[in-house]
């Protein structure tokens, strides 16, 4: 098959490769304080850490991505850690009419992979 | 809205962002000769280049993730580019009766954004 | 419909602890933050704590702290609210509420556990 | 914390007239968007709470227009313009500026 087998665990140690990690953000820093009421706090899930050879491949073209970075490093860049999946998340927010709630389906990360 | 307008032109200078770039490749350069037997050589299209800010963005969580990185640039690593779209691609390969025909669905990249 | 489905009631002695259940049915459980408040026999409410199913990430009243610990699972859609060192004073009914963060709007509630602390 | 105080303690009315209940908070609910960060449950009896109004006066989904939240800072107040039976139960007041949240300690509602 196309597929090598992707690998789970990390050989660059605990940490290291690419994993969800919550990052905690205001309305401000994200620059959205003048339209969304709530939350005013946010719990960000987001993709971070390296993708060794192999690691969590996303598909085969990571798999091929992975092997050409390994014979050409500068030509091929290594896979990345991007979501592969996402969790919707509710916002309230200002509108013309007042305050109405939307659900967001691509705003924070629900898991990751290499691609 | 949640989706500020996603940046088109690069702003570091042409070829340096996020773009589909083709890369051959042989058949041992994948490690596939011994089960591919045709195309010997591929043509395959790689997502390359960087992601500067707001450069292609995927959706929401890369906007948001381009947002943080400014901010905390250790902490929230920049979006990288990635495939946003494949094009099929038959093999012809080996099998215990012979020899067949496979399509491929994530083998090559079609389209490239910044996730 | 989306329903909040607590755990049922519970009888425990002083010193002990309790673990309530509030399972989310019909909806999308990591879109919101989970609260729980209670409510002592004809008194009124009182915010314990709250969790963000999404990360994990716990919030509690210094009043409850290190007394209480709120968890979520998300691959079964359920929070818990475990509560230790039980006195008659937690002799009370336990709900859990979805709300927006800690921001309010807690628009749906469960139907509350009620815990009974006697000796 | 913030504190909350509600008056009345209790509040008996006649259906078809108007009823108002006042909240009282120890620190100013007003955000720095403009929006104050106060909410009005309902809790009839034997039932868990509804959320009626949220961010000092926006009507929860379903909640009849008879009800408005009005307000700001530290003085808030709900009222009902024509008390049904269905009326009836403990009203409270919640902050959610800053955690811990707190409640108001209630006032009943009931039919003369």
């Known amino acids: 098959s196309a597929h090598a087998h992707p690998r789970d665990s990390c050989p660059l140690g605990p940490g290291r490769c690419c994993h969800l990690e919550t990052v905690q953000a205001t309305l401000e820093d994200l620059g959205w304080s003048d339209w969304v009421l709530s939350p005013r706090q946010l719990q960000l899930s987001m993709c971070v850490g390296e993708c060794p050879h192999l690691y969590r491949s996303a598909n085969t073209h990571a798999q091929i991505k992975a092997r050409l970075h390994g014979l050409q490093p500068d030509k091929v860049p290594a896979p990345c850690c991007v979501p592969s999946s996402y969790t919707p998340v509710v916002l309230m927010h200002r509108t013309d009419s007042g305050v109405s709630l939307q659900t967001y389906d691509d705003l924070v990360a629900r898991g990751c992979h290499c691609a | 809205s949640a989706h500020a307008h996603p940046r088109d032109s690069c702003p570091l200078g042409p070829g340096r962002c996020c773009h589909l770039e083709t890369v051959q490749a042989t058949l041992e350069d994948l490690g596939w000769s011994d089960w591919v037997l045709s195309p010997r050589q591929l043509q395959l299209s790689m997502c390359v280049g960087e992601c500067p800010h707001l450069y292609r963005s995927a959706n929401t969580h890369a906007q948001i993730k381009a947002r943080l990185h400014g901010l905390q640039p250790d902490k929230v690593p920049a979006p990288c580019c990635v495939p946003s779209s494949y094009t099929p691609v038959v093999l012809m390969h080996r099998t215990d009766s012979g020899v067949s025909l496979q399509t491929y669905d994530d083998l090559v990249a079609r389209g490239c954004h910044c996730a | 419909q989306v329903q909040l489905v607590q755990s049922g009631a519970e009888v425990k002695k002083p010193g002990s602890s309790v673990k309530v259940s509030c399972k989310a049915s019909g909806g999308t459980f990591s879109s919101y933050y989970i609260s729980w408040v209670r409510q002592a026999p004809g008194q009124g409410l009182e915010w314990m704590g709250g969790?963000?199913?999404?990360?994990?990430?716990?919030s509690y009243a210094q009043k409850f702290q290190g007394r209480v610990t709120i968890t979520a699972d998300e691959s079964t859609s359920t929070a818990y609210m475990e509560l230790s060192s039980l006195r008659s004073e937690d002799t009370a009914v336990y709900y859990c509420?979805?709300?927006?963060?800690?921001?309010?709007?807690?628009?749906?509630w469960g139907r509350g556990t009620l815990v009974t602390v006697s000796s | 914390d913030i504190v909350m105080t509600q008056s009345p303690l209790s509040l008996p009315v006649t259906p078809g007239e108007p009823a108002s209940i006042s909240c009282r908070s120890s620190?100013?609910?007003?955000?720095?968007?403009?929006?104050?960060?106060l909410d009005w449950y309902l809790q009839k009896p034997g039932q868990s709470p509804q959320l009626l109004i949220y961010?000092?006066?926006n009507r929860a989904s379903g909640v009849p227009d008879r009800f408005s939240g009005s307000g700001s800072g530290t003085d808030f107040t709900l009222k009902i313009s024509r008390v049904e039976a269905e009326d009836v139960g403990v009203y409270y007041c919640m902050q959610a500026i800053g955690v811990p949240l707190t409640f108001g300690g209630g006032t009943k509602v009931e039919i003369k």
């Open positions: 620190q100013s609910l007003l955000y720095s968007n403009g929006y104050n960060y």
């Open positions: 961010l000092g006066s």
């Open positions: 969790i963000a199913p999404i990360s994990g990430t716990a």
């Open positions: 509420a979805r709300g927006l963060a800690y921001d309010g709007y807690f628009d749906l």
